[in-house]
Amino acid sequence: APVPPGEDSKDVAAPHRQPLTSSERIDKQIRYILDGISALRKETCNKSNMCESSKEALAENNLNLPKMAEKDGCFQSGFNEETCLVKIITGLLEFEVYLEYLQNRFESSEEQARAVQMSTKVLIQFLQKKAKNLDAITTPDPTTNASLLTKLQAQNQWLQDMTTHLILRSFKEFLQSSLRALRQM
């Protein structure tokens, strides 16, 4: 698995470099996760034909993956820093159960899947420090998450492959939209 941001050899070799600001750290963290997702997508697409499948809609109906919409305040029209930040954190917390599902779904990229999961937890902590209105952030119910995880794991092989593909694609899109908005803050 790749080394987490701030721990690569370049950082060690340059001790006099300015420490990263909180925004730079978040930016770097998201790009690190996006790199991890790319690696996982590569394995998924090589292993099955899910990436070209037109049957995505069938599986997508069973998943309630977080999505960015205009009302969330993260787009330029109606941009609202606090509303958007709450949406990003809430969305990431909702993705955690799906990232847990991904854990055992990869053969050659098992470490990478773990790195994406752990890096997302760190990202949530970074963002929570940035948010002023933590009360507005709703944490998913653990019991609901547990039964969702059981349901996802009980699917047939084709649906499990499709679910993996959809989770990775949706998580990537969510992170891209999140970082677009964060770069305006």
Partner: nanobody
């Protein structure tokens, strides 16, 4: 890395319109966030507009809001900038840029591929 070529620049009178195109060669154009920047003589390059992987997610500089429209056609590997109500102060070389992370943003450092630019001159 993607190769970018701009076209559509030219000389136009104030109040007129132009449509710039940026065509990308290379695979997976749809996974790139794309942006337009411009550089007027003697000035620094500045952000104009950008469009995310989700084509509804666009951002504009204040100077471009209401007059310029950014769009993309993934089937044609092309991004556009429709510029209306042009002013002499819009005179600049317009550059198109791509971000392989699919994020984009209002700063040059967010982009890893750049075109050579196309000249836009607005006469009064």
């Amino acid at each position: 890395e993607v190769q970018l070529v701009e076209s559509g620049g030219g000389l136009v009178q104030a109040g007129g319109s132009l449509r710039l195109s940026c065509t990308a060669s290379g695979r997976s154009f749809s996974s790139y966030a794309m942006g337009w920047f411009r550089q007027a003589p003697g000035k620094e390059r500045e952000f104009v507009a950008d469009i995310g992987v989700n084509p509804d997610n666009t951002w504009y500089a204040d100077s471009a809001k209401g007059r310029f429209t950014i769009s993309r056609d993934n089937a044609k590997n092309t991004m556009y900038l429709q510029m209306n109500s042009l002013k002499p102060e819009d005179t600049a070389v317009y550059y198109c840029a791509a971000d392989s992370y699919g994020v984009g943003g209002g700063a040059e450092r967010y982009y890893d591929s750049w075109g050579q630019g196309t000249q836009v001159t607005v006469s009064s």
